[in-house]
Amino acid sequence: TTELTEEKYEYKEGQTLEVKCDYALEKYANSRKAWQKMEGKMPKILAKTERPSENSHPVQVGRITLEDYPDHGLLQVRMTNLQVEDSGLYQCVIYQHPKESHVLFNPICLVVTKGSSGTPGSSENSTQNVYRTPSTTAKALGPRYTSPRTVTQAPPESTVVVSTPGSEINLTNVTDIIRVPVFN
């Protein structure tokens, strides 16, 4: 039996949640991925990737951005401008047929509180530096940035194939499979 352990993230309003969801690339590289919030027994899909997944092709739904890296078996999730009401339990989802449930672990428990986050609009202390010289730059030597694709928010959907961040459970060695009911 593998325990589903939550990872708790605490943020102030206005900050950005930034997490990764690992998946078995040989199984799920070409699958659609989604980000869902657990609202009672009904998981609510907030955003999902397109099919087939493409590297460096972000999908944006409101404040949520998903970037799938099928070459690396990684889904990057960002939720910007966090609000208190965003608090809750989140999971990454492999968006497949409901009966093909593969359970991974490490759901995200997000706690957003009011207060100064040092985000835009906050006042900063004046600096007391004596000297400062011109700026230098370092570059990330990665793929060129592509503007995120904006997607219209679809109605909430439900799914059962849960793939949450962390390492994949090898189903041949798992005795307890968690099955999430489907609601139509």
């Epitope: 900050q15 985000t119 990330a140 962390g166």
Partner: antibody
Framework: QVQLVQSGAEVKKPGASVKVSCKAS????????IHWVRQAPGQGLEWMGW????????NYAQKFQGWVTMTRDTSISTAYMELSRLTSDDTAVYYC??????????????WGQGTLVTVSS | SYELTQPPSVSVSPGQTASITCSGD??????VCWYQLKPGQSPILVIY???KRPSGIPERFSGSKSGNTAILTISGTQAMDEADYYC????????FGGGTKLTVLG
């Protein structure tokens, strides 16, 4: 407690390869990415890539693609970084580092002690 | 490619406040962390998630953000704080800023 212990200093000739090891202890090795970062003399920190110990998959910075290889041996909780076709520009201290959490790529909360690689003819 | 820009050097008198900036495109939507690096030592994480301090890091270290600029502030700077400081973010790949050498005068 979490520890990352790296192999000792190396002196290599130009054109040769070097393989640096990073032995992890104090946590479940498979659960966290291992990153490799280097610092050349007088230069800043440079991220080389990450290794997912669970799958063995790696993601390399574009600069290093084709001449760096990151692998692991889960039986001894050790990650490896091999750099080929060395030049004098590769003289640097090489660090391994571990993610703070299973569900993030940054920050790097734990670091190895560093391995000095000197490339000289 | 993604870039993070830092001033190469900042100087401050003991007991004063030092501020080191790090700017980059869309940095306001990225989680920023900061590392301290002293000669002959491994980097130390001093700030993560924009403004959180790992255990063991003194309270005089704080982080904040204004727009697409992250700021590491060291209040009541001490001689032992003299070091190189690097910001870091994740945008497809991991990127470090160019580093800022903090000099404590006197």
């Amino acid at each position: 407690q979490v520890q990352l212990v790296q192999s000792g200093a190396e002196v290599k000739k130009p054109g040769a390869s070097v393989k640096v090891s990073c032995k992890a202890s104090g946590y479940t090795f498979n659960g966290y990415y291992i990153h490799w970062v280097r610092q050349a003399p007088g230069q800043g920190l440079e991220w080389m890539g990450w290794l997912n110990p669970n799958s063995g998959g790696a993601n390399y910075a574009q600069k290093f693609q084709g001449w760096v290889t990151m692998t692991r041996d889960t039986s001894i909780s050790t990650a490896y970084m091999e750099l080929s076709r060395l030049t004098s520009d590769d003289t640097a201290v090489y660090y391994c580092a571990r993610d703070q959490r299973k569900t993030t790529v940054t920050p790097f909360e734990y670091w190895g002690q560093g391995t000095l690689v000197t490339v000289s003819s | 490619s993604y870039e993070l820009t830092q001033p190469p050097s900042v100087s401050v008198s003991p007991g004063q406040t030092a501020s080191i900036t790090c700017s980059g495109d869309k940095l306001g939507e990225r989680n920023v962390c900061w590392y301290q690096l002293k000669p002959g030592q491994s980097p130390i994480l001093v700030i993560y998630q924009d403004n959180k301090r790992p255990s063991g890091i003194p309270e005089r270290f704080s982080g904040s953000k204004s727009g697409n600029t992250a700021i590491l502030t060291i209040s009541g700077t001490q001689a032992m704080d003299e070091a190189d400081y690097y910001c870091q973010a994740w945008d497809r790949n991991v990127v470090f800023g160019g580093g800022t050498k903090l000099t404590v005068l006197g």
